[in-house]
């Protein structure tokens, strides 16, 4: 799997999970989240060469198509596969509220 | 939706469905499929600017992050959303066999 265990250990130009820390105030302009101040969001990036972690029949077909037609622009792309939620604390006035924001953290990637 | 109804009617540089006909023999080197000779596979391509059809909380966050940090390389990517199967006819010796290949046709796209 193109997850932290694999991608953070290896120098990988191909599609892989990349570390990305997002500071809510500085990077998003969000002042409304009290805790955490930021989080490891991560992101997916890198080339999708022939059959590198292709996730669907179509992406495998496209990968093969590109190998035979190298001038083609129709290539798979490196995107998130598994995502996890992030629990945040914010205030509604003086009242603290805990909320789980879905699909905030990328755990693994794929070529799609 | 970034589907044929929208994308094939509009000239769109941003993430959209693109037409792609794949000839099994010529483009994939597959001689084993008897019918059809090829099919409209389509593919997804184009830029994913600020919140263009972002499909998850993470891709929206990443989009906002990129707006505030334009030097960042962590941008969403244009990939397939809805896929459909393709029914094919091939032969096992002299015996015709009909098979449905899943996820072969891209029907719509998203920024992920």
């Amino acid at each position: 799997a193109l997850d932290a265990a694999y991608c953070f250990r290896n120098v990988q130009d191909n599609c892989c999970l990349r570390p990305l820390y997002i500071d809510f105030k500085r990077d998003l302009g969000w002042k409304w989240i009290h805790e955490p101040k930021g989080y490891n969001a991560n992101f997916c990036a890198g080339a999708c060469p022939y059959l590198w972690s292709s996730d669907t029949q179509h992406s495998r077909v496209l990968s093969l198509y590109n190998t035979i037609n190298p001038e083609a622009s129709a290539s798979p792309c490196c995107v998130s596969q598994d995502l996890e939620p992030l629990t945040i604390l914010y205030y509604i006035g003086k009242t603290p509220k805990i909320e789980q924001l879905s699909n905030m953290i990328v755990k693994s990637c794929k070529c799609s | 939706a970034l589907d044929a109804a929208y994308c094939f009617r509009n000239v769109q540089d941003n993430c959209c469905l693109r037409p792609l006909y794949i000839d099994f023999k010529r483009d994939l080197g597959w001689k084993w499929i008897h019918e059809p000779k090829g099919y409209n596979a389509n593919f997804c391509a184009g830029a994913c600017p600020y919140l263009w059809s972002s499909d998850t909380q993470h891709s929206r966050v990443l989009s906002l992050y990129n707006t505030i940090n334009p030097e960042a390389s962590a941008s969403p990517c244009c990939v397939s959303q809805d896929l459909e199967p393709l029914t094919i006819l091939y032969y096992i010796g002299k015996t015709p066999k009909i098979e449905q290949l899943s996820n072969m046709i891209v029907k719509s796209c998203k920024c992920s």
Epitope: W32, Y90, I92, G93, K94, E99 | R60, L64
Partner: antibody
Framework: DVQLVESGGDLVKPGGSLRLTCVAS????????MHWVRQAPGKGLQWVAY????????YYADSVKGRFTISIDNSKNTLYLQMNSLKTEDTATYYC?????????????WGQGTLVTVSS | ETVLTQSPGTLSLSPGERATLSCRAS???????LAWYQQKPGQAPRLLIY???SRAPGVPARFSGSGSGTDFTLTISSLEPEDFAVYYC?????????FGQGTKLEIK
């Protein structure tokens, strides 16, 4: 320069529907919590609803809960208020406003307002 | 919900005079959950003070806010002709956000 421009106000019959629009410009729209506030003719200000961009957390005043829906199109820098089952007491000028940053906060920028009249 | 009561309902003063507007909350707001707005006929409200005492950008120094708990005050040290308007206080300590009924500041 930060600008908020509302539109969509109209004369509508009781029980009818209307969608108000607020287009923002001059700042990173998705960074600030957005509110709708209304003001009946000759009366004071009344808070209606808020939405947190990107994460789409929304909250409503009891008087409009179940009838009004606040939504946002982050990519178009646009805030909406879908108003259904309108009552005569919903007649007011509707303002969209941006908070300083917190969910409940002072509102530093306001639109010019759009008038909704509910009458038979 | 928190009820805000503004007094007086109408204040008649002359340019150059000092104006003191009061806002009382039905429950404690703490020290920093109150804002003041100015509204002129046909216009949207304009933020003057937030956090009970912080002036919004571009607001003249003659406007000042004070108070905590349940009692808050907006003071205009020396009235200018353009200051005659309706003033609202707003609390954001508790949901829902509520506004006072307004104080009309008119020329005497």
């Amino acid at each position: 320069d930060v600008q908020l421009v509302e539109s969509g106000g109209d004369l509508v019959k009781p029980g009818g529907s209307l969608r108000l629009t607020c287009v923002a410009s001059g700042y990173t729209f998705s960074s600030n919590v957005m509110h709708w506030v209304r003001q009946a003719p000759g009366k004071g200000l009344q808070w209606v609803a808020y939405v947190i961009p990107i994460v789409d957390i929304a909250y409503y005043a009891d008087s409009v809960k179940g009838r009004f829906t606040i939504s946002i199109d982050n990519s178009k820098n646009t805030l909406y208020l879908q108003m259904n089952s309108l009552k005569t007491e919903d007649t007011a000028t509707y303002y969209c406003a941006r908070t300083l940053g917190l969910v409940l906060d002072a509102m530093d920028y306001w639109g010019q307002g759009t008038l909704v009249t509910v009458s038979s | 919900e928190t009820v805000l009561t503004q007094s007086p309902g109408t204040l008649s003063l002359s340019p150059g005079e000092r104006a003191t507007l009061s806002c009382r909350a039905s429950q404690s707001l703490g020290s920093s959950y109150l804002a003041w707005y100015q509204q002129k006929p046909g216009q949207a409200p304009r933020l003057l003070i937030y956090g009970a005492s912080s002036r919004a950008p571009g607001v003249p120094a003659r406007f000042s806010g004070s108070g905590s708990g349940t009692d808050f005050t907006l003071t205009i040290s020396s009235l200018e002709p353009e200051d005659f308007a309706v003033y609202y206080c707003q609390q954001y300590a508790d949901s829902p956000i509520t506004f006072g009924q307004g104080t009309k500041l008119e020329i005497k």
